[in-house]
């Protein structure tokens, strides 16, 4: 049914005809996400009519149908202005049961109505800056947070929980004031950590899950994204003991997430959100990643369970295959691994053994090849300085921040970017916090050491002198040509 | 009959081993000597790399050393405002407030009479009023059309602090200073068993013998280029844009017979300035044939290719390209949340409509 016909039916006002028109429109457009310009004015007119009814109150019998039509039109950018008003948003919030209320509604809300309203709000907040502002002013986050806190007590359908969390994600992603409010006033980290535990269905002492079901995966990912939004600009501050305990507890849940698989093919996505959030934990709380007790089948190194570190390394390997969105794919996991390595000697030694094993192949440049080391060295000259920096920093820490060792494994040419940035091109401070770390040379390396070009990091035969056979005068003449060039350059 | 060695034989074997070891160590010592040539145009960020070494490495500049830069800071500040005022005439830009013309005249008088390392309150007041003028700001915004230090705005915006009688330059102030480097500055440093000699080559033609020893057996050339130079208009005495000038020299050096097997470390500096500029000044100013978008990623990659493609010995000669932002020491301390904004944006992008 065309929007004009629906709008005409609405204006005549006969209830059954209106409902039938809306139903027909909904059926036809349930999967429409782009709209024809030719009917834009008709859709805008229909949107205005829907809004006027919405603001006066929808009849209980047909609320879901009306809200479905609103949801479809809220996908159309040209209709956003009609829906993004204070009254419309308030009406939708009331139907979603997230308006600040003087009295709790005595009867349980209709879940279908609640769900449709939440979907409308998600569409509006995603697409309309005005709706974002109005939603923040209406403090929708308060009742959303309250409802998240109720998941333990009352059973809400998966979809309601998912859209609650999605709306929370959108509000915190798009509004810094809401982010702050959820983080501070509304105890967001505790609230969502609690929700995450409930969703994962684990207590931190238990063994990791095998596979997280599809719905739980969806909800967990939304929770992880909201937690990311509210912690990324907050946890850079020092945390007190009470907060540190909370973040450590969150860390134990994230440890579970890293070790768990997700249903379908969503494991990497799930791990991605987990790793992003790990990067926001206060550094002193990352020790929980190495706190898993040893059990049969776990990977032990220097008496420490390395399962989580190993899982993160495997995740990094997977992510390095991608070319698209490289920065956000690899920087978080590299950051987490770097900090673990920086603070924990066993983690550093384990990672070094995996990533920078003692050098054997000294005939190939460090950036050539398919080993993890080669891929990371390649990133050290990446166009994106953030990518370059995290890759270089990771390898530098694995070298115990020893410049000679760093050059040995990566070559001075590749290392120059980090060294220049840190003011270490001409050496550096004496080795500090890592002095106890030894580096072992293989027989192959020792044999070839004298022939290794420190700049390229590989064995190179001494090149013939290009000036061989020239007289001093000729050499001087050539040199002066260069000098003239440099003179030009430095003017 | 046993195969035991006599005492003399044993001693002879030991002596022979020792000689071999010493020969090998001598060979290693020679092989482990790394000779670096540091090259770059006037404001390529070359000297900043050297200064940066000093700042983060060791404990930075001492207060005494910082004090010695006071005169340079003042000179840079005064030269910058003078360059802008002169350019106003050339670009036919009027002062926003006509009264500033008197200040401009006064500036030349006071600047000429200024004692090195001192800035009078009167001179500071004149500079401050001029810098605030809308005409001066308009001219500053067109600085790509004349020669102006990158640090101009940094010092002029901070004039209140700099003009204090008890002013001592900060590490960041020192990093921003601009002094013409001449001749060769040789730096030696050692990484464990690697002995580095870095020759910072200025443009002065000092004695020839010195140059020859400089060019022989170079392991790597560090070549600095300011990415942000791409849109600078030619000065009257220039034949080509500074970026093209750098490329021409890079070509000559990269393919010069002295440096047949010499690796090149190419520093494309001032990426922060470039990132800002590229939003407003298209890359076609420098490369008319460029057909890509004016995003940092695409434009920077194009410049990188322009330089790397000049290498005629791709199979034997390595070019290591690094994009850097030399003046920001904070930028180089490890940033844990380098990507948070991008993550949120992408998480939003992945959110569909319902």
């Amino acid at each position: 049914m065309e929007p004009r016909a629906v709008a005409d039916a609405l204006e005549t006002g006969e209830e059954d005809a209106v409902t039938e028109a809306l139903r027909s429109f909904n059926r036809e457009h349930s999967q429409s996400f782009t709209f024809d310009d030719a009917q834009q004015e008709d859709r805008k007119r229909l949107a205005k009519l829907l809004v006027s009814v919405l603001e006066q109150g929808l009849s209980p019998k047909h609320r879901v149908t009306w809200l479905q039509t609103i949801r479809i039109l809220s996908r159309d950018r040209s209709c956003l202005d009609s829906f993004a008003s204070r009254q419309s948003l308030h009406a939708l919030a009331c139907y979603a049961d997230i308006a600040i209320s003087e009295e709790p509604i005595p009867q349980p809300p209709d879940m279908d109505v609640l769900l449709e309203s939440l979907k409308c709000l998600c569409n509006l907040v995603l697409s309309s800056p005005t709706a974002q502002m109005l939603a923040a002013e209406a403090r929708l986050v308060v009742r959303l947070a309250e409802r998240v806190g109720l998941y333990r007590k009352r059973s809400y359908p998966h979809e309601v929980q998912f859209f609650d969390l999605r709306l929370l994600f959108l509000l915190t992603a798009l509004r810094t004031d809401v982010r702050q409010q959820l983080f501070q006033e509304l105890h967001g980290v505790r609230l969502l950590t609690d929700a995450l535990e409930l969703t994962l269905g684990v207590a931190p002492k238990e063994n990791p899950l095998v596979i997280l079901p599809a719905q739980e995966t969806e909800r967990a990912m939304e929770i992880l994204k909201v937690l990311f939004n509210i912690t990324y600009d907050s946890v850079k501050r020092e945390v007190d003991e009470e907060d540190a305990a909370l973040y450590r507890y969150l860390g134990t849940l994230l440890r579970h997430c890293v070790m768990a698989d997700a249903a379908g093919d969503r494991t990497e996505e799930f791990h991605g959100h987990t790793v992003n959030l790990l990067g926001n934990l206060p550094l002193k709380c990352l020790d929980v990643l190495l706190a898993l007790e040893l059990h049969e089948g776990s990977l032990e190194f220097m008496g420490v369970n390395m399962d989580v570190i190993n899982a993160l390394l495997a995740f990094l390997e997977k992510r390095l295959h991608q070319t698209h969105r490289l920065k956000e794919c690899v920087a978080p996991v590299l950051s987490v691994l770097t900090e673990c390595a920086r603070m924990h000697r066993p983690a550093r030694k384990f990672l070094k053994a995996q990533v920078l094993p003692p050098l054997r192949d000294v005939r190939t440049r460090p950036e050539v090849g398919d080993l993890l080391r080669n891929k990371l060295v390649r990133l050290m000259t990446h166009l994106d300085t953030d990518v370059k920096r995290v890759a270089a920093e990771f390898l530098f820490v694995l070298c115990s921040e020893s410049v000679p060792r760093f050059i040995k494994y990566t070559g001075y040419g590749n290392a120059a970017g980090l060294l220049a940035a840190r003011g270490l091109m001409a050496g550096g401070r004496p080795e500090g916090q890592y002095s106890e770390d030894e580096d072992t040379d293989t027989e192959e390396y020792r044999e070839a050491k004298a022939s290794i070009n420190p700049v390229t990091g590989r064995v190179e035969e001494k090149p013939p002198n290009p000036m061989e056979g020239m007289t001093e005068e000729q050499k001087e003449h050539e040199a002066m040509k260069l000098v003239n060039m440099f003179d030009k350059l430095s003017r | 009959m046993g195969c035991t060695l006599s005492a003399e034989d044993k001693a002879a074997v030991e002596r022979s081993k020792m000689i071999d070891r010493n020969l090998r160590e001598d060979g290693e010592k020679a092989a482990r000597e790394v000779k670096l040539l540091l090259l770059g145009a006037g404001e390529s960020g070359k000297s900043t790399i050297v200064k940066q070494m000093k700042i983060i490495h060791e404990a930075g500049y001492s207060e005494e050393e910082c004090k010695q830069y006071k005169a340079v800071v003042y000179s840079n500040t005064i030269q910058s405002i003078i360059a802008i005022i002169r350019a106003m005439g050339r670009l036919k830009i009027d002062f926003g407030d006509a009264a500033r013309a008197d200040d401009a005249r006064q500036l030349f008088v006071l600047a000429g009479a200024a004692e090195e390392g001192f800035m009078t309150a009167e001179l500071a007041g004149v500079i401050k009023r001029l810098w605030k003028d809308s005409g001066v700001q308009a001219c500053f915004n067109r600085s790509r059309e004349y020669q102006l230090n990158d640090s101009a705005a940094y010092y002029l915006n901070d004039l209140d602090r700099i003009a204090q009688p008890n002013y001592i330059p900060t590490q960041q102030d020192v990093l921003r200073t601009r002094v013409k480097t001449t001749g060769i500055v040789e730096t030696h440093f050692t990484f464990k068993d690697l002995h580095f000699k870095m020759f910072d080559v200025g443009g002065q033609r000092s004695e020839r013998k010195k140059w020859i020893h400089c060019f022989e057996g170079v392991t790597a050339i560090i070549f600095c280029v300011a990415l942000s130079d791409y849109d600078l208009v030619l000065a009257e005495d220039e034949e080509m844009n500074r970026m093209h000038e750098s490329m021409k020299l890079f070509d000559s050096i990269c393919n010069n017979k002295w440096f047949t097997d010499t690796s090149i470390i190419l520093f494309l500096n001032k990426k922060d300035l470039f990132e800002e500029k590229i939003k407003k000044s298209p890359l076609t100013i420098c490369y008319p044939e460029y057909a890509g978008s004016n995003t940092y990623e695409e434009a920077a990659a194009y410049i990188q290719c322009q330089f790397e493609d000049l290498n005629k010995r791709k199979d034997t000669k390595e070019i290591y390209t690094h994009f850097t932002c030399a003046t920001d020491t904070k930028n180089v301390q490890f940033v844990f949340d380098a990507v948070t904004d991008v993550i949120i944006k992408n998480n939003l992008k992945d959110c569909g409509l319902f």
Epitope: I100, S101, E102, E103, P104, R139, V142, R143, A145, E146, V148, G149, L150, R152, E185, L186, H187, R190, L191, D194, E242 | -
Partner: nanobody, 126 residues
Framework: QVQLVESGGGLVQAGDSLRLSCTAS????????MGWFRQAPGKERELVAA????????YYGDSVKGRFTISRDNAKITVYLQMNSLKPEDTAVYYC???????????????????WGQGTQVTVSS
């Protein structure tokens, strides 16, 4: 020992206003629902008003609707009761109470509340 301390009670004329405050001794209370109850001599304890942990949901007893307002300031771990248009029948001892469950949204029933203050007397003379 967790404490709830009420203040602000006193003797007022009918039609006057009064503001009660209740401050908790621990930060965790900012995650609990809190309420005000009252008990007049010889009567049952009744709910005056309650507020969820985040302040998004409020409950009022029928007799005070439109006259009393409950609010909270989680940064100060304090809950307030603003009483306007007071009547002699509002005379009672007013108790502050808290539910000891994290992220609780509150309730009309006294049995749901785990912590109680000592009470503050409010007397409204005609």
């Amino acid at each position: 020992q967790v404490q709830l301390v009420e203040s602000g009670g006193g003797l007022v004329q009918a039609g006057d206003s009064l503001r009660l405050s209740c401050t908790a001794s621990e930060r965790a209370f900012s995650r609990y629902a809190m309420g005000w109850f009252r008990q007049a001599p010889g009567k049952e304890r009744e709910l005056v008003a309650a507020v969820s942990w985040a302040g998004g949901t409020t409950y009022y007893g029928d007799s005070v609707k439109g006259r009393f307002t409950i609010s909270r300031d989680n940064a100060k771990i304090t809950v307030y009761l603003q009483m306007n248009s007071l009547k002699p029948e509002d005379t009672a001892v007013y108790y502050c109470a808290a539910e000891a469950r994290e992220f609780s949204v509150g309730s009309y029933y006294a049995t749901e509340y785990d912590y109680w203050g000592q009470g503050t007397q409010v007397t409204v003379s005609s």
